[in-house]
Interface confidence: low
């Protein structure tokens, strides 16, 4: 599923991401834009053999199990395939764990490079939330 900007903002808000661990909703929508272009089925292979999955490109080295990543920790205790669902519940719950793990949203390279320090509220402007 490819979400619309406001559609994703509403879904993320419904799942409790607005101001979760201090990060406003715009940060999450911005991260999803530059990680996956709002596509829940996005996958990208990394040079270390791990893969990033889903709308927030969650990595199989640490957070989920795809059965092919050596030394995977699977800290979210989920199959990586769950992160590709059109239902973003699994991605959101795992993201909550990631953002709470000490580095905040710096865990997402795209957020660091494209969203951090910018007017992220622009990503939810005009949305009925």
């Amino acid at each position: 599923k490819v979400f619309g900007r406001c559609e994703l903002a509403a879904a993320m808000k419904r799942h409790g991401l607005d101001n979760y661990r201090g990060y406003s909703l715009g940060n999450w929508v911005c991260a999803a834009k530059f990680e996956s272009n709002f596509n829940t089925q996005a996958t990208n292979r990394n040079t270390d053999g791990s893969t990033d999955y889903g709308i927030l490109q969650i990595n199989s080295r640490w957070w989920c199990n795809d059965g092919r990543t050596p030394g995977s920790r699977n800290l979210c205790n989920i199959p990586c395939s769950a992160l590709l669902s059109s239902d973003i519940t699994a991605s959101v719950n795992c993201a909550k764990k990631i953002v709470s793990d000490g580095n905040g949203m710096n865990a997402w390279v795209a957020w660091r490079n494209r969203c951090k320090g910018t007017d992220v509220q622009a990503w939810i402007r005009g949305c009925r939330l």
Epitope: G16, Y20, R73, N77, I78, N93, C94, S100, D101, G102
Partner: nanobody
Framework: EVQLLESGGGLVQPGGSLRLSCAAS????????MGWVRQAPGKGLEWVSY????????YYADSVKGRFTISRDNSKNTLYLQMNSLRAEDTAVYYC??????????????WGQGTLVTVSS
């Protein structure tokens, strides 16, 4: 402010059952890994069980597997521990706790005040 309030402890005969409850406030338990830890008289803390925030996984210490069941009711913001086939060695103060994020074997960062379970005939 995070608060955890346990209830449901008491005296029960061997082979009996109890259900412990933990009412949480100051946060949503659906966002957290939540667990139960116990301390038997004169002994150290023993991890009993926890439930992952994503709802996929529950974990149990070997000593309680098959007898205890952890669950939660997100609408009531309450965690439960159903304890069946209780044994004398289950006698302890049981603490509800919020698990630290990120690491499966990490510790707990918030605790309740505990509820005493005594298994005796």
């Amino acid at each position: 402010e995070v608060q955890l309030l346990e209830s449901g402890g008491g005296l029960v005969q061997p082979g009996g059952s109890l259900r412990l409850s933990c009412a949480a406030s100051g946060f949503r338990i659906s966002d957290e890994d939540m667990g139960w830890v116990r301390q038997a008289p004169g002994k150290g803390l023993e991890w009993v069980s926890y439930i992952d925030n994503n709802g996929y996984s529950t974990y149990y210490a070997d000593s309680v597997k098959g007898r205890f069941t952890i669950s939660r009711d997100n609408s009531k913001n309450t965690l439960y521990l159903q304890m069946n086939s209780l044994r004398a060695e289950d006698t302890a103060v049981y603490y509800c706790a919020k698990k630290q994020y990120g690491y499966q074997n990490g510790g707990f960062d918030y605790w309740g005040q505990g509820t005493l379970v005594t298994v005796s005939s």
